[in-house]
């Protein structure tokens, strides 16, 4: 058993049928010695008396808010949460496996640049009685500071019969140099509590591996005289690291017909313009990627050909 | 993904082309190592990230763009005198380049070159003959060093009398390649910045 926060404790249970569970001793936080009784949650049934209460915690029915009283007055509370270990592996019931980029990916994180700021998000089908707490650091043995905000509900979607809820959090490394070569990964730890169930999820990454630039901005077409060709031009996104000559991007320009089945023409360039043939009803899209370290491509920025 | 090959203009900053080749070569070599050594811990998540140049060179600090010198987090041990030699500067005057930048890059290359050659000698003794260093990568390191044109003492190749542990050697190769790829990215950024200056 360990303390998650004041008066909230996590009991770790090896979770299998007929498991013996864990013996837990609760102590009433009071100078009083006599006349103390214990109850669980809203029940008025007295579970025991005395300054300490010994319970065998086996299932969720044994978890909850234990309260010690004296003469109708509440003295203190202890909330017991359960953390299930199923055949050596901590349970992951609360969050959905996003399966990208690989199985057992519960937290996904992205950064728009090398400033040390990043966003992580996760999915759940649970809508109520749910709380999250996020901590982060650079490295784990001698951790350096990363400050995270509060997790917030950022999107709701309907997936088949289920509603899916997306939560996200923004974090900022306290003293980040955009040009630094990372040798210690960022660690992100999310504590999740649903009713009386506690779970924790972690992700470890280098900022360089989670870079996803914003799409190029000011995408424009300039028709070339007496030609079906157009000059496409764009600019680096505002959120990208500067100077651009040091933090360079490379670009992919795509001409896509109205039908998804039509052949796509693609050009790769390090410049911020390209000449392409503009077909009728087609659209031109441009996306960006770090020129030297191949992390994710940005989303597409698009303009119609007409 | 293969990086686009830039054909440099004659007047172009001479090292940019070499640094692009270097990044391409080390990326290819790392990819090959990850595929060939699939049963070894060779992915970025599995290896220890060691920098053999730590405390010996200061490439990131010495080659910091001017725009980032205002960022205190980037100013750990920054030298302040300016570069004066090295043919890559190609007679351009630039306030960006600080005394250690190009010589620091040269020292990095020299250290990695020695490590890679020592390692290759060990790998050639492996009865499994599982993996060797790409000669192209070694040649590209050499070309960039020549283009940098710094006079520096030759570092003797390390020789080892004890029987090599091939498992450890292959893990060390992965660690070295990951670190060298990161340094090659920094070198490419620096050369790109200098080229634009």
């Amino acid at each position: 058993i360990w303390e998650l926060k004041k008066d909230v404790y996590v009991v770790e249970l090896d979770w299998y049928p007929d498991a013996p569970g864990e013996m837990v001793v609760l102590t009433c936080d009071t100078p009083e010695e006599d006349g103390i009784t214990w109850t669980l949650d809203q029940s008025s049934e007295v579970l025991g008396s005395g300054k300490t209460l010994t319970i065998q915690v086996k299932e969720f029915g044994d978890a909850g808010q234990y309260t010690c009283h004296k003469g109708g007055e509440v003295l203190s509370h202890s909330l017991l949460l359960l953390h299930k270990k199923e055949d050596g592996i901590w349970s992951t019931d609360i969050l959905k496996d996003q399966k990208e980029p690989k199985n057992k990916t519960f937290l996904r994180c992205e950064a728009k640049n090398y400033s040390g700021r990043f966003t992580c998000w996760w999915l759940t089908t649970i809508s109520t009685d749910l709380t999250f707490s996020v901590k982060s650091s650079r490295g784990s043995s001698d951790p350096q500071g990363v400050t995270c905000g509060a997790a917030t509900l950022s999107a709701e979607r309907v997936r088949g019969d289920n509603k899916e809820y997306e939560y996200s959090v923004e974090c900022q490394e306290d003293s980040a140099c955009p040009a630094a070569e990372e040798s210690l990964p960022i660690e992100v730890m999310v504590d999740a509590v649903h009713k009386l169930k506690y779970e924790n999820y972690t992700s470890s990454f280098f900022i360089r591996d989670i870079i996803k630039p914003d799409p190029p901005k000011n995408l424009q077409l300039k028709p070339l005289k007496n030609s079906r060709q157009v000059e496409v031009s764009w600019e680096y996104p505002d959120t990208w690291s500067t100077p651009h000559s040091y933090f360079s991007l490379t670009f992919c320009v795509q001409v896509q017909g109205k039908s998804k089945r039509e052949k796509k023409d693609r050009v790769f360039t390090d410049k911020t313009s390209a000449t392409v043939i503009c077909r009728k009803n087609a659209s031109i899209s441009v996306r960006a990627q770090d020129r030297y370290y191949s992390s994710s491509w940005s989303e597409w920025a698009s303009v119609p050909c007409s | 993904r293969n990086l686009p090959v830039a054909t440099p203009d004659p007047g172009m900053f001479p090292c940019l082309h070499h640094s692009q080749n270097l990044l391409r070569a080390v990326s290819n070599m790392l990819q090959k190592a990850r595929q060939t050594l699939e049963f070894y811990p060779c992915t970025s998540e599995e290896i220890d990230h060691e920098d053999i140049t730590k405390d010996k060179t200061s490439t990131v600090e010495a080659c910091l763009p001017l725009e980032l010198t205002k960022n205190e987090s980037c100013l750990n041990s920054r030298e302040t005198s300016f570069i004066t030699n090295g043919s890559c500067l190609a007679s351009r005057k630039t306030s960006f380049m600080m005394a250690l930048c190009l010589s620091s890059i040269y020292e990095d290359l020299k250290m990695y070159q020695v490590e890679f050659k020592t390692m290759n000698a060990k790998l050639l003794m492996d009865p499994k003959r599982q993996i060797f260093l790409d000669q192209n990568m070694l040649a590209v390191i050499d070309e960039l060093m020549q283009a940098l044109n710094f006079n520096s003492e030759t570092v003797p190749q390390k020789s080892s009398l004890e029987e090599p542990d091939f498992y450890k050697t292959k893990i060390k190769l992965c660690i070295l390649l990951h670190a060298f790829r990161i340094r090659a990215v920094t070198i490419d950024r620096v050369m790109s910045y200098l080229n634009a200056s």
Epitope: D14, D18, D93 | E46
Partner: antibody, heavy 115, light 112 residues
Framework: QVQLVESGGGVVQPGRSLRLSCAAS????????MHWVRQAPGKGLEWVAF????????YYADSVKGRFTISRDNSKNTLYLQMNSLRAEDTAVYYC????????WGQGTMVTVSS | QSVLTQPPSVSGAPGQRVTISCSGS????????VKWYQQLPGTAPKLLIY???QRPSGVPDRFSGSKSGTSASLAITGLQAEDEADYYC????????????FGTGTKVTVLA
């Protein structure tokens, strides 16, 4: 004490369907994940499928994906395996088992797929 | 095919010590715990070892398990006639959990 009893096995022609049941007793069935494991005659153990305690997630072996469906009815304390498009290679003893460090197995039910 | 490899058979005289190996990789045994089962003819598997080296109550201390790196082993000391059975190791893969990975199985023969 924990008890698992499989039923529903038998002889079936290739391409036909069969539904296996596993009746659980002696524990809070709705709190635990459950597996189906099979063993072809004279062969080793092969995992077939898993369902979480609340039925929210289901996992299948590649060899049965798209043909078999695992389900549970927690109000009836019963685990099911719906087997469609059966093949000769599905012939095996099918066991249900609890998920956890200490597991409990049923006695098994024989499924024979033969023309 | 199983990704956990066991020898097809091992044998020993009564009273002897036999060991069964179970070889995997970094993503399965290297990252997860190992169980061992004993299966007597015509019966369901019985748990012998969990969490690599732990014995459930009722399992004789003649059975012991260990794990090192990407392989595990089961040792039976003081071999007895009733130990003649099939033995299976089981683990998980970090990317396909909760799918059970079973070993290929080992037939233990007690020599007369």
């Amino acid at each position: 004490q924990v008890q698992l009893v499989e039923s529903g096995g038998g002889v079936v022609q290739p391409g036909r369907s069969l539904r296996l049941s596993c009746a659980a007793s002696g524990f809070t069935f709705s709190s635990y994940g459950m597996h189906w494991v099979r063993q072809a005659p004279g062969k080793g153990l092969e995992w077939v499928a898993f369902i979480e305690y609340d039925g929210s997630n289901k996992y299948y072996a590649d060899s049965v994906k798209g043909r078999f469906t695992i389900s549970r009815d927690n109000s009836k304390n019963t685990l099911y395996l719906q087997m469609n498009s059966l093949r000769a290679e599905d012939t095996a003893v099918y066991y249900c088992k609890t998920h956890g460090s200490h597991d409990n197995w049923g006695q098994g039910t024989m499924v024979t797929v033969s023309s | 095919q199983s990704v956990l490899t066991q020898p097809p058979s091992v044998s020993g005289a009564p009273g002897q010590r036999v060991t069964i190996s179970c070889s995997g990789s970094r993503s399965n045994i290297g990252s997860n715990t190992v169980k061992w089962y004993q299966q007597l003819p015509g019966t369901a598997p019985k748990l012998l070892i969990y969490y690599n080296d732990q014995r459930p109550s009722g399992v004789p201390d003649r059975f012991s398990g260990s794990k090192s790196g990407t392989s595990a082993s089961l040792a039976i000391t003081g071999l007895q006639a009733e130990d003649e059975a099939d033995y299976y190791c089981q683990s998980y893969d970090r990317y396909t959990h909760p799918a059970l990975l079973f070993g290929t199985g080992t037939k233990v023969t007690v020599l007369a």
